[in-house]
């Protein structure tokens, strides 16, 4: 569909005569009839197959034609066609004299014709005008013409219909050849799909308008390329949604169980060496001169009462020094210069000669000790506390402060590691010398029977509408990850549809 346009520019009839040579009275009131038809090698009369058009009277004798619609006519003249433009044509332009106001062919005498021109040729669709001038013996006509496509028609022969649109059924304009050209940000056969933010993950992201990136369930981040870990995951990551893969040193379903207390908390003081010994459990190996669970206590070297025979101990930077009483000598005052004759035994101790009187030994009564029975018994001297327990004097009695994992008056009892019921899912606990062991029931494994191996809450396919099922090991239940458009614990409800309850 298109329009053949003819622009009349100037008509010259200086003598004001008709084709017959007869003059017009008073002058030639001139109007035009145009006939457009298919190509003919020799243009002949007959039907104007492509259309006809007439003008009103445009002037008298010689005149220029204004480029407008004056007098009710139109310039350029429009000859619309509703077919594919063939690229060739024939054109007949007749100039007529109108003696009266009636311009109908039947109302005019045959000799009212002023001039007739006929041309034919090729003409491509386009915006450019072709200028032409036709001269006869008495007249001259200057005009130009072109073929353009009607609104919504495109292509070399105006055969391609295209109506631009910008709504949910398409976002496009029409190219000169009639093909669609998507508006910026749109793609697809009819430009109905928005182009998402550059880099938006193809599967995990989508968009409802251009340059957007909306994440599908289980994904997050600007480009929807980061999975969402299991709800409550503390020290873990995921590679697919709802996972919780623990960082080094962490364990448990939510990666919230500290398996590397030493590194995370540095509990050992004063340069002690820390060893992990289970969940939230550790042992400090103290450097010389320190004691306590965390090696937080500084040991005085005199605390172990190294001086014998009533010698007094003095702490020094690099150790200690014993001040011996008269009659004794040696690093710990262990050597005596006395004999039983000197009554060296105190507190009722009895003296016994040794080495032919060169030496002696005191036999002390109860509650006294020392080479000369000079010390009241320190109940901690015998180091009665087992398993590294710390002995504390409490007047006439003593008390052991036990290290973690031991109990009893003398820390002689190993606390059962099984007392805390550490084995999950009904596992049986066995105490070992340095730890415990779990014997797991069928379907579970791992140090604490925490790993489910065969019994799976997802095995029964409880999720509807192609939802993805994840097993929650902490509760023996499942979690359904719903696809777009569904909600509910089993993804059984389409979005917008409330569940129907039986009551």
């Amino acid at each position: 569909s298109g329009v053949f346009q003819l622009q009349l520019q100037e008509f010259i009839n200086e003598r004001g005569v008709l084709a017959s040579g007869r003059p017009c009275e008073p002058g030639c009131r001139t109007f035009f009839r145009v006939c457009l038809k298919h190509f003919q090698a020799v243009v002949s009369p007959g039907p104007c197959t492509f259309g006809t058009v007439s003008t009103p009277v445009l002037g008298t004798n010689s005149f220029a034609v204004r480029d407008d619609s004056s007098g009710g006519g139109r310039n350029p003249l429009q000859l619309p066609f509703n077919f594919t433009w063939p690229g060739t044509f024939s054109l007949i332009i007749e100039a007529w004299h109108a003696p009266g106001d009636d311009l109908r062919p039947e109302a005019l005498p045959p000799d009212a014709l002023i001039s007739k021109i006929a041309i034919q040729g090729s003409l491509a669709v386009g915006q450019n005008w072709l200028l032409d001038e036709q001269t006869s013996t008495l007249t001259r006509l200057r005009y130009s013409y072109r073929v353009i496509c009607s609104d919504n028609y495109y292509g070399d022969n105006c055969s391609r219909l295209c109506k631009k649109r910008n709504d949910h059924f398409g976002h496009y304009v029409c190219q000169p050849d009639g093909n669609l050209s998507c508006l910026p940000g749109w793609t697809g056969e009819y430009c109905q799909q928005p182009i998402c933010l550059s880099g938006c993950h193809e599967q995990n992201g989508y968009c409802s308008k251009p340059a957007e990136c909306l994440c599908r369930p289980g994904w997050q981040g600007r480009l929807c390329n980061e999975c969402i870990p299991h709800n409550g995951c503390r020290h873990g990551t995921c590679s697919t949604p709802w996972q919780c893969t623990c960082d080094e040193g962490w364990g448990g379903l939510f990666c919230d169980q500290d398996l590397n207390y030493c590194t995370h908390h540095s509990p050992c003081k004063n340069g002690a060496t820390c060893s992990n010994s289970g969940q939230r459990s550790y042992t400090c190996t103290c450097r010389p001169g320190y004691t306590g669970v965390d090696c937080e206590l500084e040991l005085s070297e005199c605390d172990s009462n190294p001086c014998r025979n009533g010698g007094s101990c003095k702490d020094q930077e690099d150790g200690y020094h014993c001040l011996c009483p008269p009659g004794y000598y040696g690093l710990h005052c262990e050597h005596s210069t006395l004999s039983c004759a000197d009554s060296p035994c105190f507190n009722g101790g009895s003296c016994r000669e040794r080495n032919q009187g060169a030496n002696y030994a005191c036999e002390c009564p109860p509650n006294f000790t020392g080479s000369n029975c000079e010390k009241k018994v320190d109940r901690c001297t015998s180091n009665p506390c087992a398993n590294g327990g710390q002995c504390l004097n409490r007047g006439p009695s003593r008390m052991c402060r036990c290290r973690p994992g031991f109990t009893g008056t003398y820390c002689e009892l190993h606390v059962s590691d099984c007392a805390r019921n550490p084995c999950a899912h009904g596992g049986t606990c066995h105490d070992l010398e340095n730890g415990l062991m779990c014997t797991c029931p069928a379907g579970f494994s791992g140090r604490r029977c925490e790993v489910r191996t065969s019994i799976d809450a997802c095995a029964s396919s409880p999720c509807f509408n192609r939802a993805t099922c994840y097993t929650d090991l902490s509760t023996d239940t499942f979690v359904c990850n719903c696809p777009y458009g569904f909600v509910g614990s089993r993804c059984e409800f389409p979005v917008g549809l409330p569940p129907s309850f039986p009551w």
């Epitope: 609104d151 919504n152 219909l161 109506k163 649109r165 910008n166 709504d167 949910h168 059924f169 398409g170 697809g188 056969e189 009819y190 109905q192 799909q193 928005p194 989508y206 968009c207 409802s208 909306l214 777009y484 458009g485």
Partner: antibody, heavy 117, light 108 residues
């Protein structure tokens, strides 16, 4: 071949809701839209709305905007139309159809919804 | 609200040309689509984008559009063409889509 299979007939009371499903097969679901059209007994076709199967964008007929919801599930290639607050004049055959560039080239078989007290 | 107007009925004898019109203010800028619906059946697309014919639709069906009027032409109508015909289009904004009221074609 392209098929759109709709859910079965429904009888509902005034004020209730109805959901009609439209299971698509034989083509790439997310490359097309789905439109819903209804036809009351002895009456003409009435456009209800459109949904993009790719991203869930919707366009609803003004008259039904407050009562209709259209959704789609790419995992099951199924479109849904829910109509709430049903009235007797909602009694009709409800059709879904595949849409591309505003052409509705394949249609479901239709679902009769009867609203009666 | 936007409307598309169709004649309620058109009658032709077999072999004659049937013309069904559809008028709407936005049709100069918006495409018209034509659907055929036979009794008790789902509609079938017979013309899309004013003038295009889907594969499988007989050549006797053609479409045209001029100004605010779209026309479905059935050249040499046959008895099996007896059906209701609906035009479909959108308003100028593209937000409101409507079917025409439908035209019952009788071929007798």
């Amino acid at each position: 071949q392209v098929l759109l299979i709709q859910s079965g007939a429904e009888v509902k009371k005034p004020g209730a809701s109805v959901q009609v499903s439209c299971k698509a097969s034989g083509y790439t679901f997310t490359n097309y839209g789905v439109i819903w059209v209804r036809q009351a007994p002895g009456q003409g076709l009435e456009y209800m709305g459109w949904i993009s199967a790719y991203n869930g964008n919707t366009n609803y007929a003004q008259k039904l905007q407050d009562r209709v919801t259209m959704t789609s599930d790419t995992s099951t290639t199924t479109a849904y139309m829910e109509l709430r607050s049903l009235r007797s004049d909602d009694t009709a055959v409800y059709y879904c159809a595949r849409e591309l560039g505003s052409s509705f080239d394949y249609w479901g078989q239709g679902t009769l919804v009867t609203v009666s007290s | 609200s936007y409307e598309l107007t169709q004649p309620p009925s058109v009658s032709v004898s077999p072999g004659q040309t049937a013309r069904i019109t559809c008028s709407g203010d936005a049709l100069p800028k918006k495409y018209a689509y034509w659907y055929q619906q036979k009794s008790g059946q789902a509609p079938v697309l017979v013309i899309y984008e004013d003038i295009k014919r889907p594969s499988g639709i007989p050549e006797r069906f053609s479409g045209s559009s001029s100004g605010t009027m779209a026309t479905l032409t059935i050249s040499g109508a046959q008895v099996e063409d007896e059906a209701d015909y609906y035009c479909f289009s959108t308003d100028n904004s593209g937000d409101h889509s409507v079917f025409g009221g439908g035209t019952k074609l009788t071929v007798l």
